[in-house]
């Protein structure tokens, strides 16, 4: 027994001593060097930390725990052997001594030993559970890492595939761009060639235009000569008429001997006895300025002063403010009498305005306004109309109330555009309005869907360009 105690001491383990009577029992149990120190007591049901230890540390710790378990197992076996041996000896001693009390001591010692063993077993179970828990945790971590790695590998593969696709697309687009560039260069060359051709054409046209302008100048000069001749002829005719009137003064007392003949309008010409259609010289009272006007002495009782006529497109009506003011064209053909003369005339007494229209299908219509006058130039020759009757529409195609007169160089309309430039010709444009009798002249079969034709909406509708128009005035009381 002493021998055993000595060998146990030499190992240097913790001693458990029980003193009973003359006998003293000493048990040596192994110390777990690698277990927790007393400063941080072990709690079997402690919550594990969230972040697991690094993989290598965990492996090392597992190995240490395995070693400890192995040691503990060996110690337990030794302890069992020792207890068995010791019990045999004790039983012999008990039997020899036959001391009843010693039995109780032995039971107590046994109980203590069993308790110690149970405690050790519990601790071992806890350690085992901990090891198992840690192992499971590590396995899970490894699995997660494995899955994550797989996922990353898949993503890398997908990205690589995507990059390849993009590279293919990029190269395709590069080819396309190059092809387009080539095409563009060819087109540019083609455009340049066309431009050069057009420039040649423009040069040719310019020279033709110059020729035409020269011809126009010549024609204008000839026209002026003809007009002068006509004027002279008219004067001669008037002189002859005067002479005839003078010789027949007894028969016609209306013209006294030596009286100067001048007519303000065709109504006066008609009343003086000139009842044939034709061009007459008109002069405003208290004025020396003369104008040539065509007089219609047949329609509706005669005495009509023609202030506008369109019939064949021979005269350009896209004229300046000044030209529309003084008048232009040929009184026996297409012409505009002149805004200034008409303004002065219609402000001296009340006049009616009749607009006679012809379409390309052989139809005729008219609009009659019972009161018409133009404002002065300061008020842009604004048109004033009242009392519409006639067959060319129940609604006035000249916008009401009247608008200012506009020409290509005088924009007095109510449009954000310039109506005179857009529709051509001078007119009392609104924005731009239902009429324009000074628009472009279009021949038959080319006269529909026109944006700038000779228009009278409330008779022929939009886009219909008329064949002929006549605007005529006469005193209201004629």
């Amino acid at each position: 027994y002493n021998n055993f105690r000595k060998s146990m001491d030499s190992i240097g383990k913790k001693q458990y001593q029980v003193q009973h009577g003359s006998c003293s029992y000493t048990f040596l149990l192994p110390e777990m060097d690698n277990c927790r120190s007393s400063s941080s007591p072990y709690v079997s049901n402690a919550v594990q930390r969230d972040a697991p230890l690094e993989y290598d540390d965990s492996v090392q710790r597992l190995q240490v725990l395995e070693n400890i378990m192995e040691n503990n197992t060996q110690w337990l076996m030794k302890l069992e052997n020792y207890i068995q041996d010791n019990m045999k000896k004790e039983m012999v001693e008990i039997q020899q001594n036959a001391v009843q009390n010693q039995t109780a001591v032995m039971i107590e010692i046994g109980t203590n030993l069993l308790n110690q063993t149970a405690e050790q077993t519990r601790k071992l179970t806890d350690v085992e559970a901990q090891v198992l828990n840690q192992t499971t945790r590590l396995e899970l971590q490894l699995l997660e890492h494995s899955l994550s790695t797989n996922k990353l590998e898949k993503q890398i593969l997908d990205q690589t595939s995507e990059i390849n696709k993009l590279q293919d697309k990029n190269s395709f687009l590069e080819k396309k761009v190059l092809a387009m560039e080539d095409k563009h260069i060819i087109q540019l060359q083609s455009i340049k060639e066309e431009k050069d051709q057009l420039q040649v054409l423009v040069s040719k046209q310019n020279s033709i235009i110059e020729e035409l302008e020269k011809k126009i100048v010549t024609a204008t000069v000839n026209n002026s000569v003809l007009q002068k001749q006509q004027h002279d002829l008219m004067e001669t005719v008037n002189n002859l008429l005067t002479m005839m009137s003078t010789s027949n003064s007894a028969k016609d007392p209306t013209v006294a001997k030596g009286e100067q003949i001048s007519f303000r309008d065709c109504a006066e010409v008609f009343k003086s006895g000139h009842t044939t259609n034709g061009v007459y010289t008109l002069t405003l009272p208290n004025s020396t300025e003369e104008v040539k006007a065509y007089c219609d002495m047949e329609a509706g009782g005669g005495g009509w002063t023609i202030i506008q006529r369109r019939e064949d497109g021979s005269v350009d009506f896209q004229r300046t403010w000044k030209e529309y003011k003084v008048g232009f064209g040929n009184p026996s053909g297409e012409y505009w009498l002149g805004n200034e003369f008409v303004s002065q005339l219609t402000n001296q007494q009340r006049y009616v305005l009749k607009i006679h229209l012809k379409d390309w299908e052989g139809n005729e219509a008219y609009s009659l306004y019972e009161h018409f006058y133009l404002s002065s130039e300061e008020l842009n020759y604004r048109i004033h109309l009242k009392g519409l009757t006639g067959t060319a529409g129940k609604i006035s195609s000249i916008s009401q109330p009247g608008n200012d007169f506009s020409t290509k160089d005088a924009d007095n309309d109510k449009c954000i555009c310039k109506c005179s430039q857009m529709l051509t010709g001078g007119w009392w444009f609104d924005a731009c309005g239902p009429s324009n009798l000074n628009g472009m002249y279009y021949p038959q079969r080319q006269n529909t869907n026109k944006f700038n034709g000779i228009k009278w909406y409330y008779w022929k509708g939009s886009g219909y360009s008329l064949k002929g128009t006549t605007m005529m005035i006469r005193p209201a009381g004629f």
Partner: nanobody, 129 residues
């Protein structure tokens, strides 16, 4: 020469749909406004919808708002009128017409009927069960 040709008319049941086309030639849509008009027997011609390409604005008559949609395709020089939820009172001859976009009175957005100078021949739309 300026020309407008309508197509797409026909017989359709109430609640049905039709798409009218107006093909323009002789001018480009950029500088013009295109209007759709209709005329029922014995009635006045009335404006249905208009589109102005230079600023993208559109106009609809109260009677067709929410049912009709006007659009244009400049590459085809064509204007369309998509007509949904058709009613018997939509029965009429439908015309498209053109007006220079700038022909606008100061302060106004759309054009009187008489400003539309170019017209198509029309296409008949009949809504009946």
């Amino acid at each position: 020469d300026v020309q407008l040709v309508e197509s797409g008319g026909g017989l359709v049941q109430p609640g049905g749909s039709l798409r009218l086309s107006c093909a323009a030639s002789g001018f480009t849509l950029d500088d013009y406004a295109i209007g759709w008009f209709r005329q029922a027997p014995g009635k006045e011609r009335e404006g249905v919808s208009s589109i102005r390409d230079n600023d993208g604005s559109t106009y609809y008559a109260d009677s067709v708002k929410g049912r009709f949609t006007i659009s244009s395709d400049n590459s085809k020089n064509t204007v369309y009128l998509q007509m949904n939820s058709l009613r018997p009172e939509d029965t009429a001859v439908y015309y498209c017409a053109a007006v220079p976009a700038g022909r606008l009175r100061f302060g106004e957005q759309w054009y009187p009927l008489y400003e539309y100078d170019a017209w198509g021949q029309g296409t008949l739309v009949t809504v009946s069960s």
